[in-house]
């Protein structure tokens, strides 16, 4: 009897460890995507950035999907979303089309069930990048806590994409799940 | 028999509470370090900031180590890292060496096993701090989600360190563990 | 005997699921509050923003309270706090009182037991918004990890409130609990 109870207890402990481990890992999707600058569009208009790395350098993804330039949620939950976008210009790249710039980022959520797109977060600045200086740089950081449903898609739009800094430490966005939806 | 089973159950519940509590606390290292401005260097070069508070005011640390100016990871995991850096200048401090400034922060990771240093995040802006204005201020915020291994070190580099705002609410960096590595 | 043990095991599993679920949800308060621009004060001085949405659009709250313009902590813990504040001006709104602006945000903590207010985080920039440009924009982001006690209150102060961007994706602040206090 006592031996049997111990076996049952071991089962309880074992199954709990499994359950705890499994639920813990399942409950925490994440992604950190870094810019893939081989295909940066030109112009000063607002564009959706579709080329991101998800598996090299600092870039990584787990329990989420990256497809068609969008970060797809696989698991309902509350997530912390963030983006860091750096813009830069050097005189050796040629003159700017205008010295007055609007350097912006928009983090958007698209629901494919009800096709619609909404901006979750925005940030940026108007800048006067004068020809008196040979080099210009500016970074934007945004972050916030959002309810995301499975199948929803997160994407990044920026103005003046040709001015993006292509370094992985400069231009990136990401998400990590903090908690379930009640 | 029934009493014995209840005792076993209590043991299961008790050990689980202990295990859950222990694993929960062990699994969540964090740090929030605020600038110690007693010894800020002069110059406009990039410098690694080595003086930070870890146990006064808003500064705190748990299950991580602060040593030799670096935040040392004691536990493998995925962490959210962040930094907020404020620069300021008042004309009463004397003239700036130049009105054109590059105000930058770099969050770096150093691996001591294979001595190497890599920038995880960067941010900042080029600024024109004209003599027409008596006071200038600028803040940078960066944040991101990174895999860190035990023994790796996080440090902060800034340009123009003499312009740092020494307040604990202005210049700080930190980290908190979000999840284990699978 | 064996049936009784299985029943006990089911109880253990069941109570554990309850306990795990309950503790998990209880342990994770959060809030994401977006600006309510129907009542934005004028002037360039520093003011506490008291009008925020907590239950429409992206705004949400759980296990925290929003009252009298402040986010009230209901549960001791370590929280990640963040704020994103956007300022903008278009010439159609009329001339600025001055072209030299100090656009700032302060995230403050108030303890009601010992009436006192302290700034946890600050950010911003001095800006020269010249009349040469018809539109100006600037965003600030701050974030950090803080120990908060039940009853403490978080509020947002900004300079130049009349320049705030009233969009929910632009001007918001929030918090989520990361871990218990040991």
């Amino acid at each position: 009897g006592s031996q049997h109870i111990r076996a049952e207890k071991a089962m309880v402990d074992g199954s709990w460890l499994d359950l705890a481990k499994r639920s813990k890992l399942e409950a925490q999707p994440f992604a950190h995507l870094t810019i893939n600058a081989t295909d940066i569009p030109s112009g000063s208009h607002k564009v959706s950035l579709s080329s991101w790395y998800h598996d090299r350098g600092w870039a990584k993804i787990s329990n989420m999907t990256f497809s068609n330039g969008k970060l797809i949620v696989n698991q309902d939950g509350f997530y912390y979303l963030y983006a860091n976008i750096c813009f830069r210009h050097h005189e050796t790249s040629g003159d700017l089309a205008t010295e007055y710039l609007q350097l912006m980022v928009y983090v958007t959520k698209t629901s494919i069930k009800i096709p619609s797109s909404h901006t979750l977060m925005k940030g940026g600045s108007t800048k006067y990048w004068s020809g008196n200086s040979e080099f210009h740089f500016y970074s934007i950081n945004v972050g916030g806590f959002f309810k995301l449903r499975s199948g929803e898609e997160i994407s990044i739009e920026v103005s003046n994409p040709s001015l993006l800094d292509p370094d992985q430490d400069a231009t990136y966005f990401g998400a990590f799940k903090v908690r379930d939806i009640d | 028999g029934s009493q014995h089973i209840r005792a076993e159950k209590a043991m299961v519940d008790g050990s689980w509470l202990d295990l859950a509590k222990r694993s929960k606390l062990e699994a969540q290292p964090f740090a929030h370090l605020t600038i110690n401005a007693t010894d800020i260097p002069s110059g406009s070069h990039k410098v690694s900031l080595s003086s930070w508070y870890h146990d006064r005011g808003w500064a705190k640390i748990s299950n991580m180590t602060f040593s030799n100016g670096k935040l040392i990871v004691n536990q493998d995991g995925f962490y959210y890292l962040y930094a907020n850096i404020c620069f300021r200048h008042h004309e009463t401090s004397g003239d700036l060496a130049t009105e054109y400034l590059q105000l930058m922060v770099y969050v770096t990771k150093t691996s001591i096993k294979i001595p190497s240093s890599h920038t995880l995040m960067k941010g900042g802006s080029t600024k024109y701090w004209s003599g027409n204005s008596e006071f200038h201020f600028y803040s940078i915020n960066v944040g991101g989600f990174f895999k860190l291994r035990s023994g790796e070190e996080i440090s902060i580099e800034v340009s123009n360190p003499s312009l740092l705002d020494p307040d604990q609410d202005a210049t700080y960096f930190g980290a908190f563990k979000v999840r284990d590595i699978d | 005997g064996s049936q009784h043990i299985r029943a006990e095991k089911a109880m253990v599993d069941g109570s554990w699921l309850d306990l795990a679920k309950r503790s998990k949800l209880e342990a994770q308060p959060f809030a994401h509050l977006t600006i309510n621009a129907t009542d934005i004060p004028s002037g360039s001085h520093k003011v506490s923003l008291s009008s925020w949405y907590h239950d429409r659009g992206w705004a949400k709250i759980s296990n925290m309270t929003f009252s009298n313009g402040k986010l009230i902590v209901n549960q001791d813990g370590f929280y990640y706090l963040y704020a994103n504040i956007c300022f903008r001006h278009h010439e159609t709104s009329g001339d600025l009182a001055t072209e030299y602006l100090q656009l700032m945000v302060y995230v403050t903590k108030t303890s009601i037991k010992i009436p006192s207010s302290h700034t946890l985080m600050k950010g911003g920039s001095t800006k020269y918004w010249s009349g040469n440009s018809e539109f100006h924009f600037y965003s600030i982001n701050v974030g950090g990890f803080f120990k908060l006690r039940s009853g403490e209150e978080i509020s947002i102060e900004v300079s130049n409130p009349s320049l705030l961007d009233p969009d929910q994706d632009a001007t918001y602040f929030g918090a989520f609990k990361v871990r218990d206090i040991d």
Epitope: - | S42, S44, V47, S48, S50, T98 | -
Partner: antibody
């Protein structure tokens, strides 16, 4: 690469300008340092310049030495009131990415001889 | 800030280990570099940020230290290591010289 030029024999009191010419990298995201070495002696830092043409000098060099950016690829070192003690090989060195403790690219140096 | 190097000269046998010390008059954190210079040549960067091996530097060379005390170690000494070694603080411009006085390494 970096290359120094302008070194020559001069008499005491004569002013002299040395030029550092860079290629393959930007002056605006790197420091340019001037360092000198008297015959048989150690290295002596003079100063640096970086973005925005902000120049910083060793305490002893302030006033008599001036570092300036003269084009997108050249940095000058102007020296006045030269004395015999200024006889040295003058090096130009890049501080990688504005790192000052990472002078990773040095020129071969240009010799300045001050003699009456 | 004053940088002081000891000893000089220092001798080491082929295959042995040589240690050079550098002391800063006040804390410079980890903002320190080491250079090797041979006669008639410009200095060559070996170590930066006190312990990071520079590109092209041999892995036999290592750096350590923090604050005011720093060490350069050359293990498995070779004849090619005969040179003068300099430490350099990269912390503050408020200095007369950012370099130490140099340490000559003689290989026997």
């Amino acid at each position: 690469s970096v290359e120094e030029s302008g070194g020559r024999l001069v008499t005491p009191g004569t002013p002299l300008t040395l030029t550092c010419t860079v290629s393959g990298f930007s002056l605006y995201t790197n420091l340019i340092n001037w360092v000198r070495q008297a015959p048989g002696k150690g290295l002596e830092w003079i100063g640096y310049i970086n973005y925005g043409a902000s120049a910083y000098y060793a305490n002893w060099a302030k006033g008599r030495f001036t570092i300036s950016q003269t084009s997108s690829t050249t940095v000058d070192l102007k020296m006045t009131s030269l004395t015999i003690e200024d006889t040295a090989t003058y090096f130009c060195a890049r501080g990688y990415g504005n790192d000052w403790d990472r002078l990773d690219l040095w020129g071969q140096g240009t010799l300045v001889t001050v003699s009456s | 800030i004053v940088m002081t190097q000891t000893p000089s000269p220092v001798s080491g046998a082929v295959g042995g280990t040589v240690t050079i010390n550098c002391q800063a008059s006040q804390s410079i954190g980890s903002n320190l570099a080491w250079y090797q210079q041979k006669p008639g040549q410009p200095p060559k960067l070996l170590i930066y940020s006190a312990s990071i091996l520079a590109s092209g530097a041999p892995s036999r060379v290592s750096g350590s230290g923090y604050g005011t005390e720093f060490t350069l170690t050359i293990s498995g000494v070779q004849c090619a290591d005969a040179a003068t070694y300099y430490c350099q603080q990269g912390y503050t411009t408020n200095a007369d010289n950012i370099f130490g006085g140099g340490t000559e390494v003689v290989v026997e």
